[in-house]
């Protein structure tokens, strides 16, 4: 059928909860595009009757609620003017009673669910709430240990928890829990979040800088063997993560199996106010599918991205 | 529609103290924080501090701790902020105001002000 | 507490042309969630504040799309793409990352 193919990270899930997921992949759907999605290759694609328990909100999915029969491969099908992409979503569910038993056993969650605090700080923990605006959301109430948090350190601003003055014993199982409310119906969601404290003074209000690159296009012949440096900027204190991405997935578990492009070893250089921190990308052979992608370069909360293209043809 | 309405203006001596009221209507009253930010005569804004309609939490700017109280009254959907020890630099146009939603910051919501002047 | 500072102080601008209008935080206002807490708000004279500009660059309901916002972390930036009569009045930035919550001094637009 001509599209290309796209495999995000597997989304793991819990059940008896709205989930919404938005197909979005930049730059394929900032212009005018179609967006359809399907469950595990139906050529039947997913309701758009807003009443559907399960059905397509703009570009979203969206599930009110997400049942344990649910889990399976999703495909969102992109059509631009002249391109078609089709992007597959592998979403696990599991049943969790938050308050039964500790998180920390759940298989690969994501940043979302695992959050830090910083000693001695005034910090905060974030309730990811990603659904469409047909969707309202709130009050939030946050728990620790399955008890409604409550006292002087701790005020709930938008979807955030803010603690002053972080303690080893902020440590431990927290629960966001917002009212949904969709066509008239009310659902609860109730995201866990396992928060651990560092001494490291870390996110203190610094950004990490992304010296290079600088979200540009870099022209590459197909079959070369490229390598691209991301050279970053951060405190020396400071508890960020720098990694390669494409598709919103690590290179690394992007191309597991034909290990074709890779993330490298970190390095770095001390200067007296900060560090510099290079971590390449290696393309060993540059392939067709690679052209028009954003590799993105992650630092903390900063990105930046290059696209590969391919050489003006030489008339000479 | 969400109205925030507040009472109208007030004249003090200075020392004295100034209760004004912001009634609500128009969206659930104990879902959102009530702020409070004023504005001296032709100066810029300054956030009071917020008050959450269910009465158990009050976070106010240090600036105002010792001399600011919020209340509210839940049956008519009402919330007050009291200003006591008033001096002049206290004359000002003092403004509730609600967020976008519970979820996103910024107060779309405005009562229309209520100017106190602080003079002997 | 973040101190916001907004430049230039005031500004003139005829109808139909652009305008742009600075503010800084003393303190990033990118949080690691990736939201940037940052607002903007127009008063116009003998008015409360309306909001214009919700987390940076996302605009308020009913606020006409020739206003947009963008910056970074510390660094944010107000265009007004063609400035009609009814955009006069004062311009204030704000931030809620943390409490106390702190508005810039005002920027007063007024058409020439």
């Known amino acids: 059928d001509g599209c290309k193919d796209i495999f995000m990270k597997n989304e793991i899930l819990s059940a008896s909860q709205p989930f919404a997921f938005n197909c979005t992949f930049p730059p394929i759907t900032s212009g005018e595009v179609s967006v359809t999605w399907y469950k595990n290759s139906s050529k039947i694609p997913v309701s758009k009757i807003i009443q559907s328990r399960i059905h397509q909100d703009e570009t979203w999915i969206l599930f009110l609620p997400m049942e344990w029969g649910d889990s399976g491969v999703y495909q969102c099908v992109i059509k631009g003017r002249d391109s078609c992409h089709r992007i597959h979503v592998n979403l696990t569910v599991f049943e969790k009673h938050w308050c039964d038993t500790s998180i920390g056993g759940l298989p690969n969650l994501s940043d979302e669910y695992k959050q830090i605090l910083h000693l001695g700080k005034d910090d905060s923990l974030t309730c990811h709430l990603h659904f469409p605006k047909s969707c309202v959301l709130g009050p939030i109430k946050w728990y620790k240990d399955c008890n409604e948090i409550k006292g002087e350190r701790f005020t709930v601003l938008e979807t955030r928890l803010l603690v002053s003055n972080v303690s080893a014993e902020d440590r431990g199982n927290y629960a966001c829990q917002a009212i949904l409310t969709h066509s008239g119906k009310q659902y609860e969601v109730l995201n866990g979040i396992t928060v651990s404290i560092t001494e490291r003074a870390g996110y203190g209000g610094s950004v990490p800088k992304i010296i290079y690159p600088k979200n540009h296009s870099i022209e590459v012949q197909l079959g070369t063997t490229l390598i691209v440096d991301c050279n970053v900027t951060d405190t020396k204190d400071n508890t960020n993560l720098r990694c390669w991405r494409v598709n919103n997935t690590l290179v690394d578990d992007y191309y597991d199996e034909s290990k074709r492009i890779r993330e490298g070893v970190e390095t770095h250089v001390s200067f007296r106010e900060h560090n510099l921190y290079t971590v390449n990308i290696t393309f060993l052979e540059v392939k067709m599918e690679d052209y028009g992608l954003p590799f993105m370069c992650h630092a903390g909360v900063s990105t930046a991205y290059i696209i590969l293209q391919l050489p003006a043809p030489d008339f000479r | 529609q969400v109205q925030l309405v507040q009472s109208g203006a007030e004249v003090k001596k200075p020392g004295a103290s100034v209760k004004v009221s912001c009634k609500a209507s128009?969206?659930?009253?104990?879902?959102?924080?009530m702020n409070w930010v004023r504005q001296a005569p032709r100066q810029g804004l300054e956030w009071m501090g917020m008050f959450h309609p269910t009465g158990d939490v009050t976070r106010l700017n240090q600036k105002f701790k010792d001399r600011v109280t919020m209340t509210r009254d839940t049956s008519t959907s009402t919330v007050y902020m009291e200003l006591s020890s008033l001096r002049s630099e206290d004359t000002a146009v003092y403004y509730c105001?609600?967020?976008?939603?519970?979820?996103?910051?910024?107060?779309?919501?405005w009562g229309q002000g209520t100017l106190v002047t602080v003079s002997s | 507490d973040i101190v916001m500072t907004q430049t230039p102080l005031s500004l003139s601008v005829t109808p139909g042309q652009p305008a742009s209008i600075s503010c800084r935080s003393s303190k990033s206002l990118l949080h690691r969630n990736a939201i940037t807490y940052f607002y903007w708000y127009l008063q116009k004279p003998g008015q409360p504040p309306q909001l214009l500009i919700y987390q940076m660059s996302n605009l308020a309901s009913g606020v006409p799309d020739r206003f947009s916002g963008s910056g970074s972390g510390t660094d944010f930036t107000l265009k007004i793409s063609r400035v009609e009569a009814e955009d006069v009045g004062v311009y204030y930035c704000?931030?809620?990352?943390?409490?106390?919550?702190?508005f810039g001094g005002g920027t007063k637009v007024e058409i020439k």
């Open positions: 704000a931030q809620n990352l943390e409490l106390p919550l702190t």
């Open positions: 128009g969206y659930t009253f104990t879902n959102y924080y």
């Open positions: 105001a609600r967020t976008t939603s519970m979820i996103i910051g910024g107060f779309a919501y």
